[in-house]
Interface confidence: low
């Protein structure tokens, strides 16, 4: 047995006479032989579920579910109840109604075996019948909604009449009907005004019925019509077996470059027209078992169950269903030497499914694990500026397909052929298994005899000791120019373009910092800032070279505080900033502030200045100071 609603509403008035019928509660059967028996909880509850008092006023007919006033609720009783309501005005009280047989102890009130009956309390006597509006004569203030279990015997689940109105205003005639599409499984009996199902419902055919209840009021010569929604939801049971969409029960996969633990190797989808078990229970009751194979297979793979609700069309309406993705996942990193082919089977069991037929499916995965060879190009050639600063990134080395690798460990090393010209270093990028080449020794860069640097690049997978080698030729270009005095170690300190571009900083490949002009769109990823190289900093990611020294790119790497409009990076740096962002790495602080100069005249002036510097001065920069700008403004 179950209630057709989890909550009911009615109005209560002071001194309403004993014997007044209030409302019916309805139970529907799970099996044809069941007979409902109703009982009320012992207590009345108030605001925020305060237990107010033993219920001495309202009774229920155990067989019919009719609630009625056993004795009038007088003003003093009401004041007594109000005093227990935690200081809140007592506007609503509720009772619990249980379906027997249930435990006799009154505790949780949960559908389907318990419903709450709410009474809106009016600290006045019942109003004159003539003063009641048609809406008040027809329907409760709160619109009901109904829940009916699929595949259960049909039965009565609602009674339209407002019983106190019928009892106290017998001269007002109220008629009801349901507006329903052809062939809907509901009927409203014209005499008793009971609404019932005609036959058992099937949720997989239709889950929601949005009916409309029509009430016609006759009071003397007056006739008025009131319409309200009358929604019915069909509740699911596990009556559908799992199936394969389009009959696909086998997936084939190749494991090659993606060998990392937790990599999804292949996915098979199972469809179930049901949406039960509910999400909390689903994984426990919808089981998947990787059938025993050899030890290696059991250790290497696992199956993950990812259920998702979906919608499918049935008879012109959409109903919910479930798709279950079963993912074959690597349980550990695979060595690059691993080379084998296998067939795996997964048993899926919808343990709640009662039949007919079986709730069991067998999923098949055919997996080939291929070995990976390490190859480098025969040689690399690149150039570096003699002005480059320490930690400047000048290039990358990468074994064949390294961008596609995951779970494959490759370490890069540089072996220099000239002992005193070991200028470069290499670090392995965790993201794409490439090696980032960077300037490690700027003194060596400046030696005339180090104009050409020869290295051997060695890539090693330590797990298997497999290696690959390549020649690297680095040409050192340009003249060394000493930096201006007073330049900061970090490009990020500079807050304005002129001071940014006249200094270098750690990580700068050209020996000069670069200005990145932002888009000026509020808090943006593209904020204005000074960087050693806009190719790598800031890019929202603190790379393996930048982690060597916080002065290289605090915009990506700082873990300290950021002042001003910004969105912090995860787990560090500035993801987005307002205006211009500059940083003081030693103090572990960054500041994001509005651009200093934003009026059109200034923009025009900056354009003029740029033209002067590039054309008239043949590239020799004449920088205009802030004082010059202010002077231009005032004159």
């Amino acid at each position: 047995l179950y209630f057709s609603r989890d909550a009911y509403w009615e109005k209560l008035y002071v001194d309403q006479p004993a014997g007044t019928p209030l409302l019916y509660v309805h139970a529907l059967r799970d099996a044809p032989e069941e007979v409902p028996s109703f009982r009320l909880g012992q207590h009345l509850y108030g605001t925020y579920r305060t237990r107010l008092h033993e219920n001495n006023w309202i009774c229920i007919q155990e067989d019919t579910g009719l609630l009625y006033l056993n004795r009038s609720l007088d003003r003093s009783s009401w004041e007594k109840l109000s005093g227990r309501n935690r200081g809140f005005p007592l506007l609503t009280v509720y009772l619990k109604v249980f379906l027997s047989p249930t435990s006799l102890r009154e505790g949780e009130c949960q559908w389907p075996g318990c419903a709450r009956v709410y009474f809106s309390f009016f600290n006045t006597s019942f109003p004159a019948c003539t003063s009641l509006k048609p809406r008040e004569l027809c329907f409760p203030e709160t619109r009901p909604s109904f829940r009916i279990r699929e595949n259960r015997p049909p039965g009565t689940f609602h009674q339209f009449r407002l019983l106190p109105v019928q009892f106290l205003c017998p001269n007002i005639s109220v008629a009801y009907r349901l507006l329903e599409g052809e062939g809907l499984p509901f009927r409203c009996a014209p005499d008793s005004l009971e609404v019932s199902t005609r036959w058992a419902l099937d949720r997989e055919q239709r889950e929601k019925y949005e009916l409309v209840a029509v009430c016609t009021v006759h009071a003397g010569a007056r006739e008025e019509v009131v319409m309200v929604p009358f929604p019915v939801t069909v509740y699911d049971e596990d009556d559908s077996a799992p199936t394969f969409p389009a009959g696909v029960d086998t997936a084939s996969a190749v494991v090659e470059f993606k060998r990392k633990e937790d990599t999804v190797v292949a996915t098979l989808r199972v469809f179930d027209a049901d949406v039960v078990p509910a999400s909390g229970e689903l994984v426990r009751r919808y089981t998947s078992t990787l059938l025993p194979g050899d030890t290696w297979t059991q250790q290497t793979f696992r199956v993950e169950h990812w259920p998702n609700e979906t919608s499918v069309q049935a008879n012109g309406s959409f109903v919910r269903a479930t798709v279950h993705d079963y993912r074959l996942v690597l349980n550990r990193n695979l060595s690059i030497s691993e080379n084998r082919t296998m067939q795996l089977a997964v048993l899926v069991n919808d343990s709640d499914f009662q039949g007919p037929g079986a709730g069991v499916l067998l999923l098949h995965f055919n997996v080939s694990v291929l070995p990976v060879s390490l190859h480098l190009p025969s040689s690399y050639s690149l150039s570096v500026s003699r002005r480059a600063r320490r930690f400047a990134q000048i290039g990358k080395v990468c074994v064949e397909n390294c961008q596609a690798f995951s779970g494959i460990n490759v370490q890069y090393e540089l072996h220099s052929s000239g002992a005193n010209c070991s200028t470069l270093g290499v670090v392995t990028s965790a993201e794409d298994t490439s090696g980032i080449l960077f300037v490690n020794d700027t003194k060596a860069l400046r030696r005339p005899k180090c104009a050409e640097l020869h290295y051997m690049v060695v890539a090693t997978n330590h797990q298997t000791s497999r290696q690959a080698q390549a020649q690297l030729l680095v040409t050192v270009e340009g003249l060394y120019v000493a930096e201006e005095a007073g330049c900061p170690l970090s490009c990020a300190v500079s807050k304005r373009r002129p001071e940014c571009e006249e200094c270098g900083g750690l990580g700068s490949p050209t020996g000069r910092c670069e200005w990145r002009q932002g888009d000026g769109k509020g808090i943006t990823r593209n904020f204005s800032t000074c960087s050693p190289s806009t190719k790598t900093c800031p890019d929202g990611h603190c790379d393996v070279v930048e982690t060597q020294d916080i002065n290289i790119c605090p915009q990506d790497c700082l873990r300290g505080s950021i002042v001003g409009g910004h969105e912090p990076g995860e787990p560090r740096g500035i993801k987005a900033g307002y205006g211009t962002c500059n940083c003081f790495p030693e103090e572990e602080k960054c500041f994001c502030e509005p651009e200093d100069i934003q009026d059109p005249l200034c923009d025009e002036l900056c354009r003029e200045q740029k033209l002067i510097s590039e054309e008239d001065l043949g590239g020799e920069q004449k920088l205009i100071s802030e004082e010059d700008l202010h002077h231009h403004h005032h004159h």
Epitope: Y45, Y48, R49, T50, R51, R84, R86, G87, G107, E108, C109, Q110, G280
Partner: antibody, heavy 118, light 107 residues
Framework: EVQLVESGGGLVQPGGSLRLSCAAS????????MSWVRQAPGKGLEWVSG????????FYVDSMKGRFTISRDNSKNTLYLQMNSLRVEDTAVYFC???????????WGQGTLVTVSS | DIQLTQSPSFLSASVGDRVTITCWAS??????LAWYQQKPGKAPKVLIY???TLQSGVPSRISGSGSGTEFTLTISSLQPEDFAAYYC?????????FGQGTKLEIK
């Protein structure tokens, strides 16, 4: 099986902010009032804030009104506590708890530690 | 706000002893009181609610009584697993408040 799992705790400086989350499962989340209760190291339990099932009514202990905000996302079955202007004395383990019909807390999370220190 | 005062703050007892913890409310809270047990590093666990109703799964040697402003928690025969901290909590109105706690130790 009812489960409440808190997250979002950590170390924060005085004046800073944190947002705690509590993921609920195994019961009809919308039906129940939920609360946050905290416990300073070596001290007793202190109720912090409560929220009704729909999220329309919220309740706070006076000393935290204005600084702390309780909220819930019933579509995600998640309870939140936004804590601003944190003080050293807010250092505690913060538990989320499900209120029973009678008002007592019948299920608790495992707690998340919030440390406010300079 | 409603204040709750627990007594005693510390209690030493032996296995098999009968112990009583008292909780006083600063105003009438009817039967709106709960008792919790807490072990180190764990979340509290409800023992009694509505002053005297035993939470399901809690052993019957634990009982609660009282109404209005004075409440007691009684453990009729202490077991090793009962040594823990105990708190009362009023549920009569927001803000909910807890007693300062009673630490029950092995003598």
């Amino acid at each position: 099986e009812v489960q409440l799992v808190e997250s979002g705790g950590g170390l924060v400086q005085p004046g800073g902010s944190l947002r705690l989350s509590c993921a609920a499962s195994g019961f009809t989340f919308t039906t129940y009032f939920m609360s946050w209760v905290r416990q300073a190291p070596g001290k007793g339990l202190e109720w912090v804030s409560g929220i009704s099932g729909s999220g329309t009514s919220t309740f706070y202990v006076d000393s935290m009104k204005g600084r702390f905000t309780i909220s819930r996302d019933n579509s995600k079955n998640t309870l939140y506590l936004q804590m601003n202007s944190l003080r050293v004395e807010d250092t505690a383990v913060y538990f989320c708890a499900k209120e029973n019909t009678y008002g007592h807390f019948d299920f608790w999370g495992q707690g998340t530690l919030v440390t406010v220190s300079s | 706000d409603i204040q709750l005062t627990q007594s005693p703050s510390f209690l030493s007892a032996s296995v098999g002893d009968r112990v009583t913890i008292t909780c006083w409310a600063s105003q009438d809270i009817s039967s709106h009181l709960a008792w919790y047990q807490q072990k180190p590093g764990k979340a509290p666990k409800v023992l009694i609610y509505d002053a005297s109703t035993l939470q399901s799964g809690v052993p019957s040697r634990i009982s609660g009584s009282g109404s209005g402003t004075e409440f007691t928690l009684t453990i009729s025969s202490l077991q090793p697993e009962d040594f823990a901290a105990y708190y009362c909590q009023q549920l009569d109105g927001y803000p909910y408040t807890f007693g300062q706690g009673t630490k029950l130790e092995i003598k």
